[in-house]
């Protein structure tokens, strides 16, 4: 995708759709790119990016993917086209409301990728698969 | 098609309460941050609020002339927004709309009168 | 809050011609601008979002343009349709503000 500050004219009038038929429109997901992160170790994380971009395309999902090498920890928050391979995977949970954190194979590093099809769904990213924000104690660690 | 039908304005006296709501449909409402605008007759739109994902908490943030009075709520199991107004005041007197958060998606609108 | 100017308050143009409406932001807002539409009586309509990019549905006669604080909607031929007031609106910060509105009337 394009970030917001070079983002480009385009007009698709074809109107996107999901697969019940609703109605897909531009979503707003984190945009910071690569940033230096502190998330480690804990089961869910806040991007700590202040800002937020809508998205280029409507088909378009928030994409978050944490890094973490022998020097640093990196998260990378974008919107993507799901139909697109990001880092050379494909992103198969772009229908979750939740980024839900997967690692991937890749070689010298540790990562984690997720994406989600909600607004602004890459601010929190989840490590734990167990991990259910319904639960108001977890809650309470969030957003503090 | 995508659609947000608002309703419940009227008349209601000063310092009275009134709560709005605007039934949306024909996209995923769970996912989507929601907002509500006004504009007074004859002049321009000015931001009421906003409700966030329940998924990231259903965070509410206002203006700052109806913050303190106004509050917003969402129903996503009957895809239904709600603004509650109390402690009106005449200059809240606004045609209302329920808003796709910053983007293309608004209601007809519905017509808040504070009078006495 | 961040402010939104528009200029001109209102202006009148012909079918046909060539109508620039500018937007100065009280800071930069990057490139966070939204342009809509408003015809009397009804909902205002997005045109462009992110300052240049044109929404889905809307005529490309509609550009936009600009970063930082200053930004411009140019409607390249005037349309009848076209008759309405245009607002810009930030979102790079909340609360989200507007401009107080261009009308573009008949001359």
């Known amino acids: 995708t394009i970030p917001p500050h070079v983002q480009k004219s385009v007009n698709n009038d074809m109107i996107v759709t999901d697969n019940n038929g609703a109605v897909k429109f531009p979503q707003l997901c984190k945009f910071c790119d690569v940033r230096f992160s502190t998330c480690d170790n804990q089961k869910s994380c806040m991007s700590n990016c202040s800002i937020t971009s809508i998205c280029e395309k409507p088909q378009e999902v928030c994409v978050a993917v944490w890094r973490k090498n022998d020097e640093n920890i990196t998260l990378e928050t974008v919107c993507h086209d799901p139909k697109l391979p990001y880092h050379d995977f494909i992103l198969e949970d772009a229908a979750s409301p939740k980024c839900i954190m997967k690692e991937k194979k890749k070689p010298g590093e540790t990562f984690f990728m997720c994406s989600c099809s909600s607004d602004e769904c890459n601010d929190n990213i989840i490590f734990s698969e167990e991990y259910n924000t319904s639960n108001p104690d977890l809650l309470l660690v969030i957003f503090q | 098609q995508v659609q947000l039908v608002e309703s419940g304005g009227g008349l209601v006296e000063p310092g009275g309460s009134l709560r709005l709501s605007c039934a949306a449909s024909g996209f995923t409402f769970a996912n989507a941050w929601m907002s509500w605008v006004r504009q007074a007759p004859g002049k321009g739109l000015e931001w009421v609020g906003r409700i966030k994902t329940t998924y990231s908490g259903g965070a509410t943030e206002f203006a700052a002339p109806v913050k303190g009075r106004f509050t917003i709520s969402r129903d996503d199991s009957k895809n239904t927004l709600y603004l509650q107004m109390n402690s009106l005041k005449t200059e809240d007197t606004a045609v209302y709309y329920c808003?796709?958060?910053?983007?293309?998606?608004w209601g007809q609108g519905t017509l808040v009168t504070v009078s006495s | 809050d961040i402010q939104m100017t528009q200029s001109p308050s209102s202006l009148s143009a012909s079918v046909g011609d060539r109508v620039t409406i500018t937007c100065r932001a009280s800071?930069?807002?990057?490139?966070?601008l939204n342009w809509y539409q408003q015809k009397p009586g009804k909902a205002p309509k997005l045109l462009i979002y992110?300052?240049?990019s044109l929404q889905s549905g809307v005529p490309s006669r509609f550009s936009g343009s600009g970063s930082g604080t200053d930004f411009t909607l140019t409607i390249s031929s005037l349309q009848p349709e076209d008759f309405a007031t245009y607002y810009c609106q930030q979102s790079y910060s909340t609360p989200p503000t507007f401009g107080q509105g261009t009308k573009v009337e008949i001359k």
């Open positions: 800071q930069s807002i990057s490139s966070y």
């Open positions: 808003t796709l958060d910053l983007r293309t998606y």
């Open positions: 992110a300052a240049s």
